[in-house]
Amino acid sequence: QEGKFSGPLKPMTFSIYEGQEPSQIIFQFKANPPAVTFELTGETDNIFVIEREGLLYYNRALDRETRSTHNLQVAALDANGIIVEGPVPITIKVKDINDNRPTFLQSKYEGSVRQNSRPGKPFLYVNATDLDDPATPNGQLYYQIVIQLPMINNVMYFQINNKTGAISLTREGSQELNPAKNPSYNLVISVKDMGGQSENSFSDTTSVDIIVTENIWKAPKPVEMVENSTDPHPIKITQVRWNDPGAQYSLVDKEKLPRFPFSIDQEGDIYVTQPLDREEKDAYVFYAVAKDEYGKPLSYPLEIHVKVKDINDNPPTCPSPVTVFEVQENERLGNSIGTLTAHDRDEENTANSFLNYRIVEQTPKLPMDGLFLIQTYAGMLQLAKQSLKKQDTPQYNLTIEVSDKDFKTLCFVQINVIDINDQIPIFEKSDYGNLTLAEDTNIGSTILTIQATDADEPFTGSSKILYHIIKGDSEGRLGVDTDPHTNTGYVIIKKPLDFETAAVSNIVFKAENPEPLVFGVKYNASSFAKFTLIVTDVNEAPQFSQHVFQAKVSEDVAIGTKVGNVTAKDPEGLDISYSLRGDTRGWLKIDHVTGEIFSVAPLDREAGSPYRVQVVATEVGGSSLSSVSEFHLILMDVNDNPPRLAKDYTGLFFCHPLSAPGSLIFEATDDDQHLFRGPHFTFSLGSGSLQNDWEVSKINGTHARLSTRHTEFEEREYVVLIRINDGGRPPLEGIVSLPVTFCSCVEGSCFRPAGHQTGIPTVGM
């Protein structure tokens, strides 16, 4: 061996390629006296021979697939044929050559896949075997798709894992497969040995028939549910179905209602759990989610729409216990007296809320019944027969029936007959002079009292006076309240006075009655009065254009990016200086002159969004008055958090010594937003030096399995570096340390002699 072909008798191992005709001896054993001859025993298979003089050779080609190791014994004999040395073990290891072709276990495979299945998720495996040594390229198989039929627009809908033979959909296949267009596909799959790398590799092919089945994970049609159902609840209203059994269903109420009256069972049937009330809520939108056994969403959520159908469960209601109208003595026939507006909570513009009005009684019936009529659908009351006389009947009471298609309600109307309105209001003063006020006079302050009188019947619409400012106050800073008993008008400040925009205002009042004047009488100068309001300057703080300013930026904006701006004006026209208050994270700066806000540090959505600071606007010069507004910066998520382990894994252990390779499962997470899809991490070892001892394989988007590749680990802790990539934009990778302890176990738990070590692992694998 190693170029030496002779030597003394001792244990030896030789490696010989299979399939090669013998071309040289294996070894020449030298006899030490008294030995003179040699004898060969063991797994010779009539191939291995030793000549009496100790020449070991083989007489025909070996076949590794028949026997990969020949265990032989060689003994040295003396002249009497007695063993004087040995027997010693001689091991012949047969080295593999590529003399076997791979063969598929089936000449035809059949499978099915649902439309919209997740790309990369295997739905079928093809399997081939090769008798050659799998530890060498000779037995390393490489699968590939030779052809896909039909091939639409040259797009591959299927892919195969070259090593495992797992067939799955491509991204295009997930999006485009449609059983209505093409319900079946055929793939021709090839397998090659030599890892597919050599021109001299052997190959085999198989056919795969694939049926595309409908994806039944679809939003159901909108549901209509009649309100106030008296049927026993819960009532099934619709259903969703995941494509495979075993999904866990749940409902998500995006509206966060205090009362969410729907549920879903583990079949995917959706129920309403209690009677609905359209008048409380007329429609619901919520989501159905299907999750796997790990609680990860299997697909996007489905939107469920429930419309609550109205029934006529509400009677009309009167606007008030008694509705009071006034009618003048001389009103003409057909004049409108007023409109009775009843309400119905049922659905608008339907028969359930469509109201009819009818007068059912008039009291007194003097001088006759039927003096009034009401428009059937509008509820407007009109004078029907003749002018009324106050001295005969000063008041009428009407009972009016208001009805929808099922309910009737009685409403009561009182009609007061009042004197004709033939007198106009007359101001006691036509000019109330000048009034000087500081611009910071409080809102609600009464600044002036005005008075007009009206000779018509007291406490009726003919004598009641309403004061209006008809000139000089286009901003609506002032208002007039009337005392109904005295008709006194109180001029009050409704909005802040402003020296800068209205230093002097010439105000004109008009006094009017709510009732119309009789024909031929008109308001004249006596019903008008004026006064002059002089506003004096007060140094005021700047005023922001908004109470809250809001801006939205991506959390990864470059330092120095403009993220928003605020504006304020000083009433006196002074320049303004802007500053920030409460920038606890030191993320922002503001341009003192323009109010533009810039980032000065990296922003982080995960630290909290929106980020709230106060902006301060201060007068430059003057008395340096300032005012404060809010600035809210909404941070949009970018993929800026590398994945990490979901929990503390310090307790992982294997019982030592390992009897067979073992594995353990770990979970990853990160702090970015994943919305409905959930994270899709990929896992790999952090260093090539770990590859001889460990293997990491993905279970799903968040979980992976770490397996040992051999059993020779010492009783100690090993730290395994694992890279976790989130596949985001940009992709981020976290490198995590998974500490794994190999320890002696007692009843499946790590055994440590007292005082030996702290931090005892607690999770056995």
Epitope: P137, Q140, Y142, N162, K163, M194, G195, G196, Q197, S198, S684, L685, S687, G688, S689, Q691, N692, D693, H710, E712, F713, E714, R716, Y718, R723, N725, E733
Partner: antibody, heavy 115, light 108 residues
Framework: QVQLQQPGAELVKPGASVKLSCKAS????????MHWVKQRPGQGLEWIGE????????NYNQKFKGKATLTVDKSSSTAYMQLSSLTSEDSAVYYC????????WGQGTTLTVSS | EIVLTQSPTTMAASPGEKIIITCSVS???????LHWYQQKPGFSPKLLIY???NLASGVPTRFSGSGSGTSYSLTIGTMEAEDVATYYC?????????FGAGTRLELK
């Protein structure tokens, strides 16, 4: 069987850069990390770094950071090591090796830096 | 980084002699992370022993390895002329991977 083919020699001038190649065959290239090792004449072995061909993630010996850059071309199953700002100290034999299974090394490329 | 100190640096031996080369590790490592390579002049290093004591394919049984923690050794039971080479220990426990400075074995 696994083979790692490297050019026999490269001659470059001081201050220049060189890109050494290592063509892999006999196994699936993206499965195992590729390592690079330096051996100065008459000296021992120094580990430069490793690269995962599946995603080009690399770990470097701190001593060679800035000097060596590891890359791969998956389509041709070839690993590369670029050495920059060359000096006579960089004259050495550079090996590519598969640490998986511990035993597969290229024949080495002899780099000579000389004006 | 982990430093591997080999001794002796050079040694000469006659055929049939027993050879022991030691490798001292600066901090304790698992035995599964210590490997031995043989390099003959003009050739690439060749794996001799992996995980402290496992013989690589095709390596004669006169070679053996042992050790744990910080102390490891390579033994040649009976030296043969073809064993003339430089022997390196190497650790794979921590990055950077490191090699011993080598032991040159010559024929006496």
């Amino acid at each position: 069987q696994v083979q790692l083919q490297q050019p026999g020699a490269e001659l470059v001038k001081p201050g220049a850069s060189v890109k050494l190649s290592c063509k892999a065959s006999g196994y699936t290239f993206t499965t195992y990390w590729m390592h690079w090792v330096k051996q100065r004449p008459g000296q021992g072995l120094e580990w430069i770094g490793e690269i995962d061909p599946s995603d080009s993630y690399a770990n470097y010996n701190q001593k060679f950071k800035g000097k060596a850059t590891l890359t791969v071309d998956k389509s041709s199953s070839t690993a590369y090591m670029q050495l920059s700002s060359l000096t006579s100290e960089d004259s050495a034999v550079y090996y590519c090796a598969l640490y998986y299974g511990y035993g597969d090394w290229g024949q080495g490329t002899t780099l000579t830096v000389s004006s | 980084e982990i430093v591997l100190t080999q001794s002796p640096t050079t040694m000469a031996a006659s055929p049939g002699e027993k050879i022991i080369i030691t490798c001292s590790v600066s901090s304790s490592i698992s035995s599964i992370h210590l490997h031995w390579y043989q390099q003959k002049p003009g050739f690439s290093p060749k794996l001799l022993i992996y995980r402290t004591s496992n013989l690589a394919s095709g390596v004669p049984t006169r070679f053996s390895g042992s050790g744990s923690g910080t102390s490891y050794s390579l033994t040649i039971g009976t030296m043969e002329a073809e064993d003339v080479a430089t022997y390196y220990c190497q650790q794979g426990s921590n990055l950077p991977l490191t090699f011993g400075a080598g032991t040159r074995l010559e024929l006496k």
